[in-house]
Interface confidence: medium
Amino acid sequence: SQPQAVPPYASENQTCRDQEKEYYEPQHRICCSRCPPGTYVSAKCSRIRDTVCATCAENSYNEHWNYLTICQLCRPCDPVMGLEEIAPCTSKRKTQCRCQPGMFCAAWALECTHCELLSDCPPGTEAELKDEVGKGNNHCVPCKAGHFQNTSSPSARCQPHTRCENQGLVEAAPGTAQSDTTCKNPLEPLPPEMSGTMLM
């Protein structure tokens, strides 16, 4: 079998064997190596020499195999836009941001650019749990049977109604979706003379 071509190598059909790690250089009609994530092209390839790569300077990055002659500048997460950092920028990766607690992503352009406050859920409801925090605004759903939630809040969860008998008490008023059960002390037993039927 033929030996595998190592960059730089001639390409008549303008395509390269490894599209991820190589690129076509039209001036010389050759395939050259791309630079790996975290690096950039410090010297372009020629017919006799492959691409020379250098590490991105501090506070800059390149995420992909590339033939860029510069690295991208790291950008901080903008707190004014409601964003906070979850992973710092490195030479291979831009700063990872997410919406601050209590906020959701309101503007998305490849990544979140602007967060807004989550809407309150009224009493008797709670925010439906989402797969990913901060992805969308609250969708409020009613508390399930036997549960209540008595505030207007973006994050309060429905709680189970108090079971009076567990505390040695009796129910004075049943719980609703918006209020807990009201409990009271059990009535004192009636005195013996009052226990019979009263005749008028």
Partner: antibody, heavy 121, light 112 residues
Framework: EVQLLESGGGLVQPGGSLRLSCAAS????????MSWVRQAPGKGLEWVST????????YYADSVKGRFTISRDNSKNTLNLQMNSLRAEDTAVYYC??????????????WGQGTTVTVSS | DIVMTQSPLSLPVTLGESASISCRSS???????????LDWYLQKPGQSPQLLIY???NRASGVPDRFSGSGSGTDFTLKISRVEAEDVGVYYC?????????FGGGTKVEIK
Amino acid sequence: EVQLLESGGGLVQPGGSLRLSCAASGFTFSSYAMSWVRQAPGKGLEWVSTISGSGGSTYYADSVKGRFTISRDNSKNTLNLQMNSLRAEDTAVYYCAKVRDNWNYDGMDVWGQGTTVTVSS
Amino acid sequence: DIVMTQSPLSLPVTLGESASISCRSSQSLLYSSGYIDLDWYLQKPGQSPQLLIYLGSNRASGVPDRFSGSGSGTDFTLKISRVEAEDVGVYYCMQTIQTPLTFGGGTKVEIK
């Protein structure tokens, strides 16, 4: 030959302070991020802190944040770890390690021999 | 924090045979540009750790080609194709996708 040599370990009382140093040689020190990793007796490895090549970016484990400070002196090829408010759970062998890149925190490709810190009354 | 779970805890191996160590992360270590933020380290008895594999599958300088790393988003494997006596020690995986960086608990490889 690329070498890292830690020093500054010893016995210290709870609440006390200690400053670890790591002398680097055999490579362009300022071009690489550096890390501290520790290993409690009979336990696994725990990442402590990383500093970028220039010293402009620092990262810490939650368990040491606010108590430990990583720094470097590129003119002297030295990495430091200032440890304050020490606790018994900080007892460990502390390793200094070179990161493959200038300001990443992955691929620690050269390690020192370690220096032992014992926190006990 | 990302939790790294290694298995098995201990791995008795026969010289010349192959061995595999598993590492699982509590969330994906596959970054959007296609690389995996996972390192493998070996700590031989009485020695400092040494880097074997970085970015999931790249062998560090001087590491024999009998060591290979592979894996997807959350499940990773270190394979030693022909175990030699010098391969004994504790193997650790470490995620580097976000700080705090976290190690697995380690897998102790010993000769049967």
